[in-house]
Interface confidence: medium
């Protein structure tokens, strides 16, 4: 069976007036999935993120990451889209230093 | 609801600039949204061109970066294409539309304006 | 860039029939699909979008299936007002791409 990842989108400072967010994905098997960030309603190119390993996170699930540098106050424009075993999510930049965390329900 | 009308001339000379208008009504430009200039060849082809979003930012279609401009008059609600050097290849039925970020698809288009390109 | 392959370019067909066109897209475009509809001399409407939702005031003779990279628009117990050229986008990625179209004329 496969079990769904636990999305979690946070911020950080990057530099004057730039912020990153990163997009990670936890707990989630099989390890095919596809996390990535989208400005103005189409992915990112490629260029412009950068992702991490695919990686096992000790209970026999996976684990990864996507992040990209956004400048601050154009948080609305970005979403993290995520496609697991056939199911996909949209998660939303969380405002202010909140963040955001829920599993993807099937 | 939001209206677009594009309007410019209709016949450019080839090697000289086409330059064509789109007026918003109903909305702001401002407000949200990426404004977008799609083309449509003879043969019906249809091409996305480029937007420019409500914070001034634009975005081209790389087959045409190096000859299109997207620029706008927010005191107007107009937002303007400008292609450079243009041939008969770029001659086409010209349309403005508009996306919500919830996913680039196009709700509502101009009527669309013919621009010949010839000597 | 990923290009978007519709079939047939054309097709004829009587009032009352049902009609399918498809739509394949060279790379995965995860459900990020929209369907447009063109009267002769008109400006593209559009019908569908997120690969299966029909547009406001789209009739319910209209529905739409895919996954992946392969997509369909069916059109149920077609009517005189259907007639016209089909068009798919995908907005996957940038830059977004088109269909070349389907031409549905009366048979």
């Known amino acids: 069976g496969s079990v769904p990842p636990m999305v979690n989108v946070t911020r950080s400072e990057a530099s004057e007036g730039n912020i990153t967010v990163t997009c990670r994905a936890s707990s989630f098997y099989p390890r095919n999935i596809t996390l990535t960030w989208r400005q103005d309603g189409v992915s990112l190119s490629h260029d412009t993120q950068q992702w991490g390993d695919v990686l096992p996170d000790g209970n026999g699930t996976y684990q990864t990451w996507v992040a990209t540098r956004i400048c601050q106050g154009e948080e609305q424009r970005f979403t993290c889209y995520m496609e697991h075993s056939g199911n996909h999510s949209t998660h939303p930049v969380p405002s202010g230093n909140s963040h955001h965390h829920h599993h993807h329900h099937h | 609801d939001v209206q677009l009308q594009e309007s410019g001339p209709g016949l450019v000379k080839p090697s000289q600039s086409l330059s064509l208008t789109c007026t918003v009504t109903?909305?702001?430009?401002?407000?949200?949204?990426?404004w977008n200039w799609i083309r449509q060849f003879p043969r019906n082809k249809l091409e996305w061109m480029g937007y420019?979003?409500?914070?001034?930012?634009?975005n081209y279609n790389p087959s045409l970066k190096s000859r299109i401009s997207i620029t706008r008059d927010t005191s107007k609600n107009q937002f303007f294409l400008q292609l450079i050097s243009v041939t008969t290849e770029d001659t086409a039925t010209y349309y403005c539309?508009?996306?919500?970020?919830?996913?680039?698809?196009?709700?509502?288009w101009g009527q669309g304006t013919l621009v010949t390109v010839s000597a | 860039d990923i290009q978007m392959t519709q079939s047939p370019a054309s097709l004829s067909a009587s009032v009352g029939e049902t009609v399918t066109i498809t739509c394949r897209a060279s790379?995965?475009?995860?459900?990020?699909l929209a369907w447009y509809q063109q009267k002769q001399g008109k400006s593209p409407q559009l019908l569908v979008y997120?690969?299966?939702m029909l547009a406001d005031g789209v009739p319910s003779r209209f529905s739409a299936s895919g996954s992946g990279t392969q997509y369909s628009l069916k059109i149920n117990s077609l009517q005189p007002e259907d007639f016209g050229s089909y068009y798919c986008q995908h907005f996957w990625s940038f830059p977004l791409t088109f269909g070349a179209g389907t031409k549905v004329e009366i048979k």
């Open positions: 420019i979003n409500y914070s001034g930012t634009t």
């Open positions: 109903g909305y702001s430009i401002t407000s949200d949204y990426a």
């Open positions: 997120n690969a299966i």
């Open positions: 539309s508009y996306y919500r970020y919830d996913g680039a698809w196009f709700p509502y």
């Open positions: 790379g995965n475009i995860h459900n990020y």
